[in-house]
Interface confidence: low
């Protein structure tokens, strides 16, 4: 599925990221546009052999199992394919895990190099939450 | 139950192209990978690539690029292996599998026959 | 890319032999190594993953183990359905690459 701007802004609002970690909404959004460009079946191979999932790109080496990644962790204990459902869910409650982890939003390299600094929030205007 | 049904047998010219389907049921196909797999006497199994069908992510082995071209359609649960200007080295069997690292299901294999 | 070498070539054994086959990575692959059992004109069956997890339907007296590059394959009391090929592959790196084979054959 690929997300209209201001149709992920609500569902990511409901699954309760608005200011989840002290990262206002408009922080995800953007996120999300400049790692998946808002597909949730975005998948992109690393060079160590991992990949990331998903519409926010959550890499297999530490937070998904998708069998074939060495030496995986899979901290978020899924599986790798339920990253690229329609359906959300899983990749918030990842991305939630991920963002207490100590790096905050570091963690997404997109989100450092094109959101941090940012006007997040022309990401929502707009947008009826 | 998971099932890779592939495509019947082909004989083909040399220099022609060929598309070989791989049809899955029993899972969420647009979510696992679809690996594709070389198999001629002699020479064993070779890893020819992959696809995820869900977003058309593909990885070729560096052999075989510019040989195979994968595609999917998540609409009928099919992915493809189209194989391009077919030498008698490509007479083989052409096998899908699911990729979950290992390969834990296999399609029955296509013989492709490439001959003058 | 990581080559995989499978030895002996060809086994022969009698039905009720124990065996063990080796599989050899040219460089550590971790546990990440499987095992196929073909039988002709047979698509592959997967027999055990990472090393030695059996696969669903297996019987017991598949097992396998090892680490790193060296990696065996063990059929206790080998039955007459056991006879047929036998390959590795390693899903350590890309490309993904399978063992020669072993050829178990009735003696």
């Known amino acids: 599925k690929v997300f209209g701007r201001c149709e992920l802004a609500a569902a990511m609002k409901r699954h309760g990221l608005d200011n989840y970690r002290g990262y206002s909404l408009g922080n995800w959004v953007c996120a999300a546009k400049f790692e998946s460009n808002f597909n949730t079946q975005a998948t992109n191979r690393n060079t160590d052999g991992s990949t990331d999932y998903g519409i926010l790109q959550i890499n297999s080496r530490w937070w998904c199992n998708d069998g074939r990644t060495p030496g995986s962790r899979n901290l978020c204990n899924i599986p790798c394919s339920a990253l690229l459902s329609s359906d959300i869910t899983a990749s918030v409650n990842c991305a939630k895990k991920i963002v207490s982890d100590g790096n905050g939003m570091n963690a997404w390299v997109a989100w450092r190099n094109r959101c941090k600094g940012t006007d997040v929030q022309a990401w929502i205007r707009g947008c009826r939450l | 139950q998971v099932q890779l049904q592939e495509s019947g047998a082909e004989v083909m010219k040399p220099g022609a192209s060929v598309k070989i389907s791989c049809k899955a049921t029993g899972y969420t196909f647009s979510t696992y990978w679809i690996e594709w797999v070389k198999q001629r006497p002699g020479h064993g199994l070779e890893w020819i690539g992959e696809?995820?069908?869900?977003?058309?992510?593909?990885y070729y082995n560096e052999k075989f690029k510019g040989k195979a071209t994968f595609t999917a359609d998540t609409s009928s649960n099919t992915a493809y292996m189209q194989l391009s200007s077919l030498t008698s080295e490509d007479s083989a069997v052409y096998y899908c599998?699911?990729?979950?690292?290992?390969?834990?299901?296999w399609g029955q294999g296509t013989t492709l026959t490439v001959s003058s | 890319d990581i080559e995989l070498t499978q030895s002996p070539a060809t086994l022969s054994v009698t039905p009720g032999d124990s065996v063990s086959l080796s599989c050899r990575a040219s460089?550590?692959?971790?546990?990440?190594l499987h095992w196929y059992q073909q039988k002709s004109h047979e698509s592959p069956r997967l027999l055990i993953k990472?090393?030695?997890q059996s696969s669903s339907g297996i019987p017991s007296r598949f097992s396998g183990s090892g680490s790193g590059t060296d990696f065996t394959l063990s059929i206790n009391s080998v039955e007459t359905e056991d006879f047929g090929m036998y390959f590795c592959?390693?899903?350590?790196?890309?490309?993904?690459?399978f063992g020669g084979g072993t050829k178990l054959e009735i003696k």
């Open positions: 696809i995820l069908p869900g977003s058309g992510s593909t």
């Open positions: 990472y090393v030695s």
């Open positions: 592959q390693q899903s350590n790196s890309w490309p993904r690459t």
């Open positions: 599998a699911r990729g979950d690292g290992y390969y834990g299901y």
């Open positions: 460089q550590s692959i971790s546990n990440n």
